[in-house]
Every structure is written in structure tokens, then in C-alpha cells.
């Protein structure tokens, strides 16, 4: 019980996680004018991943692609691949992840490969909250070299004729989104791999155990069973689809009831 | 304050090559690129090409391509301008100009930034 | 490459006036283009970047319109040291071309 609510939380986690990383992809406000030396202005001006918006005075908000001419900032095409390849990931993950889930049967598959699809889905999960992570920090870290560049040459004198101010950016909420769902997806792929390790079925040894019937011995194979007997061993951990029970000399008798538990 | 400063007139025989620098002051010199703009008396204004300095990528007008080789140097903060071959159509005042874009990621591009402009004279 | 004609090569314009000057490409450059002045003695100013947007420091009095291919700068109220000559330049696809410049002078 604990393990489906572990996995199935991780799920739900990774899922708003993942939805998390999209919304942020997706944004305008990765960076954001900052007001601070100039509240009242004519123009706000915000940018994302794919185009900047300037917000005038009006309302009127008019957003534009990148000038693409001379090439985008390596540190753009970083982050947005970090962001695409962690949707990419975790939208793998949550694919894998809905067939692992313990809650939902599908054939006869085993809790040994949904004990692996979990385990593949946190592993998808984690590095995709990574990446996202790994994204945000990599534009919060251009944006505050880009502040206080800015800060220091606040009063920039245009070839000596004009003072001007030089417009500086600060934190938009698109990095706080990314942050949160990266850590969010991180979270809950964490949580699926913990959930992993109670799917996964133990170890378990089994001996054969002999019953003398009229004249000749038939071994009693149970794979099946999960709990563990103590005695010998049954190293591959397989169910037992034999069709029966064989006797010692290999003669086939008659089907045992725990083939098919 | 942001300043490119430029480095003196230059008089040239034809067929000799010429180097002129740009001194760039202000400013982190690798944030932007540094154009180079051809001015022939009483003429207008002619884009010869662009250096990274970060990445040390040129783009050049296909006019001026063998005629022109850009440089810099981040360690002096200056961009570098060759021009060789020099023809009398090659006289005219050569200005370096940059684009301090005040956005993170540039949507745009400007020169807001421009040096006072090397004279060139070529003369036998 | 993209031709930036300024028709007028110079025009006389009374101080207080509301001056305009005109700028065509010979192919749609989607407003991506930019107005400088240059001074009689060669200082070259940006005024205006992408079609309409005034560059910080440049006074309201200048100001930028057009799309497609045909742009213009307008002068709201000229003032003395407005003399100078005026280019427009597109940055659509490379290389950036400049127009042949605007004279102006006050009558």
C-alpha cells in the first residue's frame, strides 16, 4: 500500500513538476525591467527564451523574436536546450511511469518490470528536474553578471555626447517557476525510485520439496510464491510456468495448483 | 562613460596596407560587437563588417571581403581594422561603432556608440 | 543587397517647424530599421531604433514611423542644433545598408 501511495504521489509530483517546466519554456518573463531607479515609465520591457515584449504605458504589448542575424547568445541556446531536453525527458518518464504504476494492470506483466519502468521513469524524472534546474541558474547567473555590468555603468555616456541610463534586468517569474518544478520533478523522481525498491520482488529461495507418492518421487516446484520459504533456491526469481509437476526423472504428473498463483 | 577611441589619420602609397585600431573604454569590450563603417567625402556611410570579441566571429560585407581583416584583443580592449591592396577609392574616414543593447539577449541591432573616425589617404 | 533611398538629398526648414524626412527599401525590411545623425563636424548620434523606438537620452521632439518598405523620421519642433545629416539604415539581412543621407538646413 505504502509503495503504490509512494509511486503514485511521485506520479503526481513529477506530472505538475513536468507541466511546471513546460509553463516556464514557454514564458515571456524569464527577465523583467527592473523598476527600481525608474518606477514610472513609458515603456516595461521583458524577455523570454524565444522572443522579448515591451509593455507600454497604454497596455499596448508588443513582442518580437530575437535578432537572429549575427547569431543568439551560446548561453540562450544553452538554456534552451537544457529546458527541451528536460520536457523531452520528463514527458518520456511520465509516459513510462503510467504503465509502471502499480494501479493500473496491464496483461500479465510482472512487478519485477514495473519495478524497472518505475525505477527508468525516477531516473527520467530526476535528470529532467536537473536540466531544468541546470537552465534557470545558467540564465539567472547571465542576468545578474548582465545587473551588475549595468549597475556599474548605470550613467553611460553615448560616444561622449549623451548621459543616458542603461536599462537593467532583474529575476522575471518564469525563473521561479522553473526553479520550482524543477525541484518538483527532482522530488518526485526521487520518490519513484524509493517506490522502485518495494516493487522490486526479493530474493527469494525456494527448495524443491519432495513428496513420495506410490512407488516414485514427484518435486514440487513452486516458484510462484513470493514469500520466502527458506529452504533452497530459486536464483532467477521466475514464476514457474512448467505446466506442472515433473518427477524427479523427469516423467510428467499431474499440474501443480501453484503454477499459476 | 562608453567611448571608442580611434587611432590617428593614416597616409598610405597605393597598394600598401594600413592598420587601424579602436580602443574601446566603459564597457565590458567582449559584450558587444564592434563594426567598422566607411565614410568617402561628401558621401554616405558604408558597413564594412563585425567582430565578436568574445568569440573572435567575423561577419563581413561581401564588397570588402579581401580587402578588410578585423581583429581583437580582449587583453588592450581593442579592435583592429587591416586594410590592404589600398586604392585611391580606398580614401575616406573609417569609423569603429558599437551597440551597447540594454537588453539581456539583443532583439535588435544598433550603433549607439561610435569612435570620432581614422582618415585615410591614399596618395601617391 | 537591400537599397535604402533617401529621395531628399537636402531640405531647408525653418526653426519651430515639423520637418519629415522619408526613407524606402527596396524590399519589405519587417521595421527593422534604424535613424542616425551626424553632425557637421563627423559625431555620429543614434536617434532612433527599430522603425519607432527612441533611443535613451534622444529628445521626444524626434520620432520614427513606416513598415513594409517606406519609413520616415519626423522633426516635431526644430530646434538649432537639429542641423545636421540624417540616414536611415536596415538591419534585416546582411549586410546592413545605410541610405544616402538627408541634408538639413535651416532656412
Known amino acids: 500500500m505504502a509503495v503504490t501511495a509512494c509511486q503514485g504521489l511521485g506520479f503526481v509530483v513529477s506530472l505538475i513538476g513536468i507541466a511546471g517546466i513546460i509553463a516556464a519554456t514557454c514564458m515571456d518573463q524569464w527577465s523583467t525591467q527592473d523598476l527600481y531607479n525608474n518606477p514610472v515609465t513609458a515603456v516595461f520591457n521583458y524577455q523570454g527564451l524565444w522572443r522579448s515584449c515591451v509593455r507600454e504605458s497604454s497596455g499596448f504589448t508588443e513582442c518580437r523574436g530575437y535578432f537572429t542575424l549575427l547569431g543568439l547568445p551560446a548561453m540562450l541556446q544553452a538554456v534552451r536546450a537544457l529546458m527541451i531536453v528536460g520536457i523531452v525527458l520528463g514527458a518520456i518518464g511520465l509516459l513510462v511511469s503510467i504503465f509502471a504504476l502499480k494501479c493500473i494492470r496491464i496483461g500479465s506483466m510482472e512487478d519485477s518490470a514495473k519495478a524497472n519502468m518505475t525505477l527508468t521513469s525516477g531516473i527520467m524524472f530526476i535528470v529532467s528536474g536537473l536540466c531544468a534546474i541546470a537552465g534557470v541558474s545558467v540564465f539567472a547567473n547571465m542576468l545578474v553578471t548582465n545587473f551588475w555590468m549595468s549597475t556599474a555603468n548605470m550613467y553611460t555616456g553615448m560616444g561622449g555626447m549623451v548621459q543616458t541610463v542603461q536599462t537593467r534586468y532583474t529575476f522575471g517569474a518564469a525563473l521561479f517557476v522553473g526553479w520550482v518544478a524543477g525541484g518538483l520533478t527532482l522530488i518526485g523522481g526521487v520518490m519513484m525510485c524509493i517506490a522502485c525498491r518495494g516493487l522490486a520482488p526479493e530474493e527469494t529461495n525456494y527448495k524443491a520439496v519432495s513428496y513420495h507418492a506410490s512407488g516414485h518421487s514427484v518435486a514440487y516446484k513452486p516458484g510462484g510464491f513470493k514469500a520466502s520459504t527458506g529452504f533452497g533456491s530459486n536464483t532467477k526469481n521466475k514464476k514457474i510456468y512448467d505446466g506442472g509437476a515433473r518427477t524427479e526423472d523427469e516423467v510428467q504428473s499431474y499440474p501443480s495448483k501453484h503454477d499459476y498463483v | 562613460q562608453v567611448q571608442l577611441q580611434q587611432s590617428g589619420a593614416e597616409l598610405a602609397r597605393p597598394g600598401a596596407s594600413v592598420k587601424l585600431s579602436c580602443k574601446a573604454s566603459?564597457?565590458?569590450?567582449?559584450?558587444?560587437?564592434i563594426s567598422w563603417v566607411k565614410q568617402r567625402t561628401g558621401q554616405g556611410l558604408e558597413w564594412i563588417g563585425e567582430?565578436?570579441?568574445?568569440?573572435?566571429?567575423?561577419y563581413y560585407n561581401e564588397k570588402f571581403k579581401g580587402k578588410a581583416t578585423l581583429t581583437a584583443d580582449k587583453s588592450s580592449s581593442t579592435a583592429y581594422m587591416e586594410l590592404r591592396s589600398l586604392t585611391s577609392e580606398d580614401s575616406a574616414v573609417y569609423f569603429c561603432?558599437?551597440?551597447?543593447?540594454?537588453?539581456?539577449?539583443?532583439?535588435?541591432?544598433?550603433?549607439?556608440?561610435w569612435g570620432t573616425g581614422t582618415t585615410v589617404t591614399v596618395s601617391s | 543587397d537591400i537599397q535604402m533611398t533617401q529621395t531628399t538629398s537636402s531640405l531647408s526648414a525653418s526653426l519651430g517647424d515639423r520637418v519629415t524626412i522619408s526613407c524606402r527599401a527596396s524590399?519589405?525590411?519587417?521595421?527593422?530599421l534604424n535613424w542616425y545623425q551626424q553632425k557637421p563636424d563627423g559625431t555620429v548620434k543614434l536617434l532612433i531604433y527599430?522603425?519607432?523606438r527612441l533611443h535613451s537620452g534622444v529628445p521626444s521632439r524626434f520620432s520614427g514611423s513606416g513598415s513594409g518598405t517606406d519609413y520616415s523620421l519626423t522633426i516635431s519642433n526644430l530646434e538649432p542644433e537639429d542641423i545636421a545629416t540624417y540616414y536611415c539604415?536596415?538591419?534585416?539581412?546582411?549586410?546592413?545598408?545605410f541610405g544616402s543621407g538627408t541634408k538639413l538646413e535651416i532656412k
Open positions: 566603459g564597457y565590458t569590450f567582449t559584450s558587444y560587437g
Open positions: 527599430y522603425t519607432s
Open positions: 567582430i565578436s570579441p568574445r568569440s573572435g566571429n567575423t
Open positions: 539604415q536596415h538591419y534585416s539581412k546582411l549586410p546592413p545598408t
Open positions: 524590399q519589405d525590411i519587417s521595421n527593422y
Open positions: 561603432a558599437t551597440g551597447v543593447i540594454t537588453t539581456v539577449i539583443p532583439t535588435d541591432w544598433y550603433f549607439d556608440v
